[in-house]
Amino acid sequence: WELTILHTNDVHSRLEQTSEDSSKCVNASRCMGGVARLFTKVQQIRRAEPNVLLLDAGDQYQGTIWFTVYKGAEVAHFMNALRYDAMALGNHEFDNGVEGLIEPLLKEAKFPILSANIKAKGPLASQISGLYLPYKVLPVGDEVVGIVGYTSKETPFLSNPGTNLVFEDEITALQPEVDKLKTLNVNKIIALGHSGFEMDKLIAQKVRGVDVVVGGHSNTFLYTGNPPSKEVPAGKYPFIVTSDDGRKVPVVQAYAFGKYLGYLKIEFDERGNVISSHGNPILLNSSIPEDPSIKADINKWRIKLDNYSTQELGKTIVYLDGSSQSCRFRECNMGNLICDAMINNNLRHTDEMFWNHVSMCILNGGGIRSPIDERNNGTITWENLAAVLPFGGTFDLVQLKGSTLKKAFEHSVHRYGQSTGEFLQVGGIHVVYDLSRKPGDRVVKLDVLCTKCRVPSYDPLKMDEVYKVILPNFLANGGDGFQMIKDELLRHDSGDQDINVVSTYISKMKVIYPAVEGRIK
């Protein structure tokens, strides 16, 4: 019995087609992805093949103005329109709190939303009961397939799930649910979830009875043969894991941002064993036309976004200096504003011993592309922020050793004076440079804000200590020559859309007046 699994993950509100790098579409003839194009391909496959499931492995939320404005209603509407069969909860589904998940998505979705390792307690337990499930048995043709969901147990550090959701270990939580499916005579089981490729592989290895793993969170691109675009494969598609009980379990992921549609064909025998698995992600490029009815719907929903862009988010009573003359040479108040917003967006009081789990921010000065003049009645709009942060990036959470941070700050000024983008703006860090010294030895003082303290204060950086840092995804991926970050990071979790982080902060503060205050000397 042959099953076709179509899958997406980490779409991050890319409802409209995007450029090849998943930023805003400029030249339509070269654009990719988007729900209208995705629907064309999905329908084409549904017509051609008998047993098809369309699955999403989480993180539909967060990433563009679509989410900022519609807050998840757009996810429910268009996933319903595409007739998704199931979705797993990702960490970003909790970005607007549990209410921001329940009302727009859980209550509106016409497909099951799954996670076996999230357990509700207290008053929330009855409120959320039945709105998401640990597993769902789906009829597919003459057969039935069990889908079990899972979500990163790091979600409390990455999003805002509140205090009434407990995130259990994925493997511990999945096994009893899979066992339950087996007792219901369901012998074809897909684990669909959002914990990253390493955990996907562990689930394939450790959870008895799981036949296929469809994952997300790590934006992993897998491909067999010559890849069709710029993404470099982390392995073959599907990636085969040998389970502890001696079975070959295919593991798949489909990069991110709706650029690809994962396409996996599985042949099962009567016992539910995977006899064969093959496929590849399908690049959703302009050779696939956008479905006209979905496109028309997108255009209808788009109108509200254009209006939102010009509305006031808050006010500034000072000039926000985002000029390259400042931000690539010295501490600039636009850099301070952005870093403060980045830390504020990551306030998670999950441990009494820590005032917060992260206190530090670094930001490449070259990523700040425009100032904002306060003389326009102080008004700040989304449009203004889009000029400051035009690249559609995210502010991510990484774990780095102190020694890596020291290398990063040396790199920041290794060719100081040439107006290059690698000069770092900071938050929760005091750095002193001596530019008379030779490159690679210019950082003379590097103090960092403590986290395991009730009164935050600055302490000298320890080379062997592991620190959490918020930074742009551009830096996490080694951009502007920060190869040491990419090579040496110990953990990387993608965060929220850059503009959204700053806009939320400005809306929260109402009036802002960031200063230059001696963070960089």
């Epitope: 019995w1 043709g141 003459d142 057969e143 040998t242 001696g246 070959k248 025998d269 009567e270 016992r271 064993n273 995977v274 006899i275 064969s276």
Partner: antibody, heavy 114, light 107 residues
Framework: EVQLVQSGAEVKKPGASVKVSCKAS????????MNWVMQAPGQGLEWMGR????????FYSQKFKGRVTMTVDKSTSTVYMELSSLRSEDTAVYYC???????WGQGTTVTVSS | DIQMTQSPSSLSASVGDRVTITCRAS??????LNWLQQKPGGALKRLIY???SLDSGVPSRFSGSGSGTEYTLTISSLQPEDFATYYC?????????FGGGTKVEIK
């Protein structure tokens, strides 16, 4: 649990036909196909062909083409294998086996003798 | 048709021995290979499917490996109940074909 139960032993004369049945249970019958495998006395296994339960599509090994007919009765989840123009070298045990031979019938002995 | 050449055709071994049986295909069959066990009474049982996946209930002393045209069944420590005949089967293309069998006997 998958189970395949085959019909009993048969003794046939050369030139006659034999029809062996295989009743399946414990799985969604229409979603799969059935194989037939022959084993002559003291010999190895030989694949004869297969039938898809849902629509009766068949694929026969060239060696048996023209003499073998596989059919299916969905209402009783039973598959049949008929072998015609029997000769002495058709004396063998005939097995039905699921899609990828994960489960086997107990075998049906067919003796062709004058 | 794809020919499956199985070797050895028979072998004698003692309990606890490591036993290796090989199947060579006349052309590349990908991972489309099963290993079957037939006990003297005639009952057939699949041990390994898709080259290396172990059927449920099959002891972990059985393992399969290989790719392309060369495939191996290994019994890491032979047990009394393992004395039987073993067959490989390719299902990469029609007609499916079996190896000639390997009879594992007590030394």
């Amino acid at each position: 649990e998958v189970q395949l139960v085959q019909s009993g032993a048969e003794v046939k004369k050369p030139g006659a036909s034999v029809k062996v049945s295989c009743k399946a249970s414990g799985y969604t019958f229409t979603a799969y196909f059935m194989n037939w495998v022959m084993q002559a006395p003291g010999q190895g296994l030989e694949w004869m062909g297969r039938i898809y339960h849902n629509n009766g599509d068949t694929f026969y090994s060239q060696k048996f083409k023209g003499r073998v007919t596989m059919t299916v009765d969905k209402s009783t989840s039973t598959v049949y294998m008929e072998l015609s123009s029997l000769r002495s070298e058709d004396t063998a045990v005939y097995y039905c086996a699921t899609s990828y031979v994960g489960d086997w019938g107990q075998g049906t002995t067919v003796t062709v003798s004058s | 048709d794809i020919q499956m050449t199985q070797s050895p055709s028979s072998l004698s071994a003692s309990v606890g021995d490591r036993v290796t049986i090989t199947c060579r295909a006349s052309q590349d069959i990908g991972d489309s290979l099963n290993w079957l066990q037939q006990k003297p009474g005639g009952a057939l049982k699949r041990l390994i499917y898709a080259t290396s996946s172990l059927d449920s209930g099959v002891p972990s002393r059985f393992s399969g490996s290989g790719s392309g045209t060369e495939y191996t069944l290994t019994i890491s420590s032979l047990q009394p109940e393992d004395f039987a005949t073993y067959y490989c089967l390719q299902y990469a293309s029609f007609p499916w074909t079996f190896g000639g069998g390997t009879k594992v006997e007590i030394k």
